[in-house]
């Protein structure tokens, strides 16, 4: 297993609709053919997998149909979007990148992006 540097923003604020986007960039010494990207959430010393996608370079990322993640790639940059976030989902979201093919296997783990989610205030009742 070879180590690889992964960069991601330190902080992102989710939109009022519970959507957060960030770029995960990996520094590889060459072009992989098959890449796996996993988003992990760390909160209260617990780490859980949020979503994962394996893609062929030059093709779109394909997450599972029921995934809360979507993404696109350009070169070594992966643009990740996480949807359906609520205040309780605030936490550190870590980008993990694996170069699956060709060998040898490279692994890189980012320092994490702290995503802050603020639930919108409910609309006040209206007489109209």
């Amino acid at each position: 297993c070879k180590a690889m540097h992964v960069a991601q923003p330190a902080v992102v604020l989710a939109s009022s609709r519970g959507i957060a986007s960030f770029v995960c960039e990996y520094a590889s010494p060459g072009k992989a053919t098959e890449v796996r990207v996993t988003v992990l959430r760390q909160a209260d010393s617990q780490v859980t997998e949020v979503c994962a996608a394996t893609y062929m370079m030059g093709n779109e990322l394909t997450f599972l149909d029921d995934s809360i993640c979507t993404g696109t790639s350009s070169g070594n940059q992966v643009n990740l979007t996480i949807q359906g976030l609520r205040a309780m989902d605030t936490g550190l979201y870590i980008c993990k990148v694996e170069l699956m093919y060709p060998p040898p296997y490279y692994l890189g783990i980012g320092n994490g992006t702290q995503i802050y989610v603020i639930d919108p205030e409910p609309c006040p009742d209206s007489d109209f």
Partner: antibody
């Protein structure tokens, strides 16, 4: 540590074939990476010639496609080879072998190079 | 093929000083660039890959930057052992192509 070492004749006659060997120590060429030949002309210009992958697939520089062949030793997987046919004086250069990750990449290990002169 | 236009072809600098070498690609190479140091009688030595990532064992005096078509290598606190020829190489597309080289001399 990984080491690469080129070897072959230092003098080749025009119209003949040039054959070079790259011996690899510290890594089996079937375990990964792409294994390249690069040459440096007398004016210092570097030219990528081609490579062979860990699983034996080739890519060549289009400028050499009709004259070049890169193969590997299939018994111990510790050597790969360059054959360049119909050489001319323009093929006089220092020839390097090197490896890179992925279908295209930056070369992290190089041999020290071997000088080849094409002359009658 | 992607052309890599490297400049200057040579430069002279003082010990302890700083130099910058540039490479311009004929198209966007999406940060897929490596930089090498080459000394006579040896193979080139990889300094930096993916624009700015230092190869293990390379001192932090070396740094790289750029995006799109424009890239640069900087060396600060120049030392006598930095005397060499430096090359850029793109790895966005085959065939792999190199810059023409920059010969660094110390004043």
């Amino acid at each position: 540590d990984v080491q690469l070492q080129e070897s072959g004749p230092g003098l080749v006659k025009p119209s003949q074939s040039l054959s070079l060997t790259c011996s690899v120590t510290g890594y089996s060429i079937t375990s990964g990476f792409y294994w390249n030949w690069i040459r440096q002309f007398p004016g210092n210009k570097l030219e990528w010639m081609g490579h062979i992958s860990h699983d034996g697939r080739n890519n060549y520089n289009p400028s050499l496609i009709n004259r070049i062949s890169i193969t590997r030793d299939t018994s111990k997987f510790l050597q790969f080879f360059l054959k360049l046919s119909s050489v001319t004086t323009e093929d006089t250069a220092t020839y390097f072998c090197a490896r890179h990750y992925g279908s295209s990449g930056a070369m992290d290990y190089w041999g020290q190079g071997t000088s080849v002169t094409v002359s009658s | 093929d992607i052309q890599m236009t490297q400049s200057p072809s040579s430069l002279s600098a003082s010990l302890g000083g700083k130099v910058t070498i540039t490479c311009k690609a004929s198209q966007d190479i999406k940060k897929y660039i490596g930089w090498y140091q080459h000394k006579p009688g040896k193979g080139p030595r990889l300094l930096i890959y993916y624009t700015s990532t230092l190869q293990p064992g390379i001192p932090s005096r070396f740094s790289g930057s750029g995006s799109g078509r424009d890239y640069s290598l900087s060396i600060r606190n120049l030392e006598p052992e930095d005397i060499a020829t430096y090359y850029c190489q793109q790895y966005d597309n085959l065939p792999l192509t190199f810059g023409s080289g920059t010969k660094l001399e110390i004043k």
